[in-house]
């Protein structure tokens, strides 16, 4: 793809960061719940 560099865009990066943040929050919540239930 001749314009491959443009796939590494800031908007795509922000979306990836938002997904990471969401997953971290969900996994963190699950972990806390597991600890609480022990």
């Amino acid at each position: 793809h001749s314009d491959g560099i443009f796939t590494d865009s800031y908007s795509r990066y922000r979306k990836q960061m938002a997904v990471k943040k969401y997953l971290a929050a969900v996994l963190g919540k699950r972990y806390k719940q597991r600890v609480k239930n022990k």
Partner: antibody, heavy 112, light 110 residues
Framework: SVEESGGRLVTPGTPLTLTCTVS????????LSWVRQAPGKGLEWIGI??????SYYASWAKGRFTISKTSSTTVDLKVTSPTTEDTATYFC?????????WGQGTLVTVSS | AQVLTQTPSSVSAAVGGTVTINCQSS????????LSWYQQKPGQPPKFLIY???NLASGVPSRFKGSGSGTQFTLTISDLECDDAATYYC??????????FGGGTEVVVK
Amino acid sequence: SVEESGGRLVTPGTPLTLTCTVSGFSLSSAALSWVRQAPGKGLEWIGIIDKGVMSYYASWAKGRFTISKTSSTTVDLKVTSPTTEDTATYFCARGGGEFFIWGQGTLVTVSS
Amino acid sequence: AQVLTQTPSSVSAAVGGTVTINCQSSKSVYNNNWLSWYQQKPGQPPKFLIYQASNLASGVPSRFKGSGSGTQFTLTISDLECDDAATYYCAGGYSGNIVGFGGGTEVVVK
């Protein structure tokens, strides 16, 4: 984040290699550029490596610089035969033509 | 080869005022909007301000506004603050995976 290293004082004609070390993202999905700034001057784009594979250069930089991926976390900039005109701070920056992560830069001085 | 021309090279304005910086490209940028803006202070790396011509990067105040398309772009800074004193650069991305920077505009805040 990105971090540059390797800047030093060199004599004209002595090849020099600068290294950009990345963390927190994969080179296989990123575009990484080298940008330089001579003392008191503006920003000058040298070239870019896309997804760690293909390299593209500014027309003035072709043959003078080589950008290559050297490990899963490092990209090198080789200055083939430095001249005094290459004295500058060299920055590594992530992004495909829009640079959203910058390093602090590494200073290269070319002098006899 | 593409050329990005920034005007003016220097501009001075009072605190609370407005400055406008122009960036003209010799050819259309990728997708007609692949133009970004940066702020740089002495001894520091550039700071990413605006992407795809008009979108504000995270944490950048809404006093900064980017506009334009194709070959003609503008950065407007309103309600100027002392902290806005810096050099501003535009950068364009072009088909063929080529990038270029404008020559920079020094903003002096009085």
